[in-house]
Interface confidence: low
Amino acid sequence: EKLPKAPVITTPLETVDALVEEVATFMCAVESYPQPEISWTRNKILIKLFDTRYSIRENGQLLTILSVEDSDDGIYCCIANNGVGGAVESCGALQVKMKPKITRPPINVKIIEGLKAVLPCTTMGNPKPSVSWIKGDNALRENSRIAVLESGSLRIHNVQKEDAGQYRCVAKNSLGTAYSKLVKLEVEVFARILRAPESHNVTFGSFVTLRCTAIGIPVPTISWIENGNAVSSGSIQESVKDRVIDSRLQLFITKPGLYTCIATNKHGEKFSTAKAAATVSIAEWSKSQKDSQGYCAQYRGEVCDAVLAKDALVFFNTSYRDPEDAQELLIHTAWNELKAVSPLCRPAAEALLCNHLFQECSPGVVPTPMPICREYCLAVKELFCAKEWQAMEGKAHRGLYRSGMHLLPVPECSKLPSMHRDPTACTRLPYLDYKKENITTFPSITSSRPSADIPNLPASTSSFAVSPAYSMT
């Protein structure tokens, strides 16, 4: 008969290195008689036999962790006891090795020049990964402004325009390398005026061009203010090159004014604004004609030729130095703006503008212009160009004039004579009368007039903006 023998661990446990999701095995070979009971602990806590994450075989001498997790790190001990002598124990460490993993990758960042930017890059891995950064195609060098923090995040103090670009972080250890996706650092710059408009002293009826140049990221928008209101006449030309916007306001000068150029750009929910002003004064202003006087003559222009009645006499305003040229220039500018509006609105707006700028004329002793009938003016505003008008008014309220569309010389409907007073004292727009029969669809617009009297038009989507100085009410 075999003699009882106290347990002896013949193969002590050793440190085991294992990768996450791999298998790790501890061997605890024991010699004894009778056969010992072997139990296992992790960090001094007993491992239960029925724990499905482990497999215990060979009478307890083999402990296998079936899929290693990073939380399995620790000290594993086997304890053998067969009732003969004392229990014996052997311990070894499990070191969970892990390829680098980026747990919090960087994200796209928009930052204002001069502020501090932090691009996160939190990593996991064993051994602890080292973190470096790539900008574009090149490794990023640290300097007095740019540092990689202990956490792996990239911190850039006093962000400059040249810091803009595409970044990615790289986490590296002995087991491998992980790359984040490319992210974009966009550097935004407050709007700044590079070239302010210059003041002018000109003769009445002259043309003046005010120029304003601004820079910023995003590229600023430029709006013009005349004596505290949006400009009521003139045309604006804009060009953008290399984040510089150049705006030129061409004015036909009939009165003095203070013109302000406002450059604005948006940073998140906030706006930055820069302003510069110039004065336009008129030499011998007191002697100029302030009252509207004029003469009747046949229309000899081109723009309104197809709109105005053939051979009709129209009123030319002598407050302009060269009335026929000045009025033709105004309508020509307006015509170009009308290219942007919907096919529904455009012919109606053309009829309105031509008949407003070149009003029918009664010669008599004092030449008298005949304004458009209020009802026709309202029909253009509220029916044919309803959507465009809403868009324009929205822009007017928010100060978002981006083109010359708000410069159209449109009459103020409420100040025009009504047909109901004297049908012979105002001009009708035949186009609207011809159009009426063809219109069958119904827009969602409100009118104070009975619905039976008005054509109902489809809503359009184009924008048609006019000067707030001529509001149709």
Epitope: N108, K181, L182, K184
Partner: antibody
Framework: EVQLVESGGGLVQPGGSLRLSCAAS????????IHWVRQAPGKGLEWVAS????????YYADSVKGRFTISADTSKNTAYLQMNSLRAEDTAVYYC?????????????????WGQGTLVTVSS | DIQMTQSPSSLSASVGDRVTITCRAS??????VAWYQQKPGKAPKLLIY???SLYSGVPSRFSGSRSGTDFTLTISSLQPEDFATYYC?????????FGQGTKVEIK
């Protein structure tokens, strides 16, 4: 290694249905948008549909709207294209491709990974 | 829908030539434009994203640029492996569109 593997193509009669699958591996599926792009024999590329794994939002070309449905199962890292009321003009190699990021961010990243394509033939 | 009009539809060139392919968008598409190369029987490969960014692993002879609504792919010195079909693609709107393709053939 990033992989996109399409399956489910084959011959189907006009008016019939097919379901294409796109099994993805090697990248974070939930941080990507998946697109189906088709190419008729001898023709150019035509975008069919997209799904943002971030939001689940779906987008369709006018030519397939109402007939095709794109979906994704993030737990299986798989995108699907259910094609109903198939027509002869739907005959093409169907590729799935991915862009990184949510739908609008991914507009800027390009379709960086593509599957090998699966042929769909609609014929009687 | 935003249309991408690609030109030319095909071109013949020799190794070492500079090749330029243009796409014109029917309306503003910001810089959400990509370029792809496709060889017969293969899936397309991304070359350029965000109008001008070179995708990793793509040779530096490929470049992209933008001027308003015009987008250009340039191959500075054509190599034998560059003979393929090239597509532009916009994803500025929620509806993605591709150009009709430009086949680059050996002269």
């Amino acid at each position: 290694e990033v992989q996109l593997v399409e399956s489910g193509g084959g011959l189907v009669q006009p008016g019939g249905s097919l379901r294409l699958s796109c099994a993805a591996s090697g990248f974070t599926f939930s941080s990507s948008s998946i697109h189906w792009v088709r190419q008729a024999p001898g023709k150019g590329l035509e975008w069919v549909a997209s799904i943002s794994s971030y939001s689940g939002y779906t987008y369709y070309a006018d030519s397939v709207k109402g007939r095709f449905t794109i979906s994704a199962d993030t737990s299986k890292n798989t995108a699907y294209l259910q094609m109903n009321s198939l027509r002869a003009e739907d005959t093409a190699v169907y590729y799935c491709a991915r862009t990184y990021g949510s739908y609008y961010v991914s507009s800027y990243t390009g379709m960086d990974y593509w599957g090998q394509g699966t042929l769909v033939t609609v014929s009687s | 829908d935003i249309q991408m009009t690609q030109s030319p539809s095909s071109l013949s060139a020799s190794v070492g030539d500079r090749v330029t392919i243009t796409c014109r968008a029917s309306q503003s598409v910001s810089s959400a434009v990509a370029w792809y190369q496709q060889k017969p029987g293969k899936a397309p490969k991304l070359l350029i994203y965000s109008a001008s960014s070179l995708y990793s692993g793509v040779p530096s002879r490929f470049s992209g640029s933008r001027s308003g609504t015009d987008f250009t792919l340039t191959i500075s010195s054509l190599q034998p492996e560059d003979f393929a079909t090239y597509y532009c693609q916009q994803s500025s709107s929620s509806l993605i569109t591709f150009g009709q393709g430009t086949k680059v053939e050996i002269k």
